[in-house]
Interface confidence: low
């Protein structure tokens, strides 16, 4: 086996093992290899009522505990720390041991904090742009001062991978600290459902803490997408509201956002993914504009980039006709009219071109029958001209 | 420097209602959903609540719905989280969280405050 560091725990009983004004504080030395390690207490000022008991071998790893009884009341007015040293692996940890005092009947016993791991997905809108870069963020919360640094594993498919870019630990106001470790991921990993594992490993930990995620399983569905204009009985209002309705998609992960003639819009905002009774997701965004600028006629275009959708992207526009004020319930009806209107527009394209052809090639028939004309009536009439030059007196 | 100030905890009857202030500070409060996640003794973290930017979509764990309302003033950066019907597992320490932007807000927070605690007597 290879040289291992002990993960070193606090042991701190409740009430129960307060006796006889004493309390029996604990160290656990876990998972080192090889022997020896040395335990101490308080840097060795602490030497009566010591217990250091035999190391056990256990898979390779040895495990070892130690024990210090201090006087429970008076509390003490050190603290009491153990200090484990593994020459082996130049390991040296000193751990702080607060006894939980659980003696009065009124209190509430507030176990000391474990740390808590989450793990994100990457934001859709990195996973569906090819020149962003997708991330699975890897958080642990609540890690105490004392704690030693949190180390952070990476596996992709259940193999380990080291691109993972971990920050310092950061303090939090509340005196906590917080750790985060990202792992930049391939985008058609993450859309083909690969698995991102993050373990979290710390001397603080009973054991590593492994959270996993990976994209929602299922088949794909493309969103509808739909825009709306503003309510004719808004229009009184200095604000409008422009409504992009996205429909029937799934997975929930999707990107809707806003075009202000070309530019990104940000007066925006977007319901979270509502689940149909279909097991499919719907969206509303709503953008508010000024009523003046819907009227001067400017375009808003709806833009929902979404994995099941052809490129991944699709956009739908929006503009004030002025002149044309139509109500909701002609909106079917207008659709059919401006279906009609491009039939009408094709048709005439079309015939007119057809036309324009018609003519080119009549005419050409014409240019090329009437210079054929000519060149035959030349050639009949140049021999006249040359007997009419030899005839002159 | 992000901050979350959580007060409003206490002693309370079971039956008996509490609200509790989050005051946030040293972000665009506005920009971020939040969340109520507690703890009681002796157990690991529990997520109770959470609102999006606008405050018009929340959703509750199984074992508050219905009494908890989780509620927010974007105007003032607070974050509330009113409780009703108390019983005696509510006891806990309830912090209110900020929720990453890379997130699903189902799924924890980056920051956090210190904690009020609601104990609810039987």
């Known amino acids: 086996a290879k040289t291992t560091p002990p993960s070193v725990y606090p042991l701190a009983p409740g009430s129960a093992a307060q006796t006889n004004s004493m309390v029996t504080l604990g160290c656990l030395v876990k998972g080192y290899f090889p022997e020896p390690v040395t335990v101490t207490w308080n840097s060795g000022s602490l030497s009566s009522g010591v217990h250091t008991f035999p190391a056990v071998l256990q898979s390779d790893l040895y495990t070892l505990s130690s024990s210090v009884t201090v006087p429970s009341s008076p509390r003490p007015s050190e603290t009491v720390t153990c200090n484990v040293a593994h020459p082996a692996s130049s390991t040296k940890v000193d751990k702080k041991i607060v006894p939980r005092d659980c003696g009065c009947k009124p209190c509430i016993c507030t176990v000391p904090e474990v740390s808590s791991v989450f793990i994100f997905p990457p934001k859709p809108k990195d996973v569906l742009t090819i020149t962003l870069t997708p991330k699975v963020t890897c958080v642990v919360v609540d890690i105490s001062k004392d704690d030693p640094e949190v180390q952070f594993s990476w596996f992709v498919d259940d193999v380990e991978v080291h691109t993972a870019q971990t920050q310092p630990r950061e303090e939090q106001f509340n005196s906590t600290f917080r750790s985060v470790s990202e792992l930049p991921i391939m985008h058609q990993d993450w859309l083909n459902g690969k698995e991102f594992k993050c373990r979290v490993n710390s001397a603080a930990f009973p054991a590593p803490i492994e959270k996993t995620i990976s994209k929602t399983k299922g088949r794909p569905k493309a969103p509808q997408v739909y825009t709306i204009p503003p309510p004719k009985e808004q229009m009184a209002k200095d604000k409008v509201s422009l409504t992009c309705m996205i429909t029937d998609f799934f997975p929930e992960d999707i990107t809707v956002e806003w075009q202000w003639n070309g530019q990104p819009a940000e007066n925006y905002k977007n319901t979270q993914p509502i689940m149909n009774t279909n097991g499919s997701y719907f969206v509303y965004s709503k953008l508010n504009v000024q009523k003046s600028n819907w009227e001067a006629g400017n375009t808003f275009t709806c833009s929902v980039l979404h994995e099941g959708l052809h490129n991944h992207h699709t956009e739908k526009s929006l503009s004030h006709s002025p002149g044309l004020q139509l109500d909701e319930t002609c909106a079917e009806a207008q659709d059919g009219e401006l279906d009609g209107l491009w039939t009408t527009i094709t048709i005439f394209i079309s015939l007119f071109l057809l036309s324009v052809c018609y003519s080119a090639a009549v005419t050409l028939f014409k240019v090329k029958w009437i210079f054929s004309s000519v060149v035959e009536l030349k050639q009949t009439l140049v021999p006249e001209y040359k007997n009419m030059i030899g005839q002159a007196p | 420097q992000v901050q979350l100030v959580e007060s409003g905890g206490g002693l309370v009857q079971a039956g008996g209602s509490v609200r509790l202030s989050c005051a946030a500070s040293?972000?665009?409060?506005?920009?971020?959903?939040m969340t109520w996640v507690r703890q009681a003794p002796g157990k690991g973290p529990e997520w109770v609540s959470a609102?999006?930017?606008?405050?018009?979509?929340?959703r509750y764990a199984e074992s508050v719905k219905g009494r908890f309302t989780i509620s927010r003033d974007n105007a003032k950066n607070m974050l509330y989280l009113q409780m009703n019907s108390l019983k005696p597992e509510d006891t806990a320490l309830y912090y209110c969280?900020?929720?990453?932007?890379?997130?699903?807000?189902?799924?924890?927070?980056?920051?956090r405050g210190q904690g009020t605690l609601v104990t609810v007597s039987s």
């Open positions: 969280g900020r929720v990453p932007g890379y997130s699903d807000y189902r799924q924890g927070y980056d920051y």
């Open positions: 040293g972000f665009t409060f506005s920009s971020y959903y």
């Open positions: 609102i999006n930017t606008g405050g018009d979509a929340t």
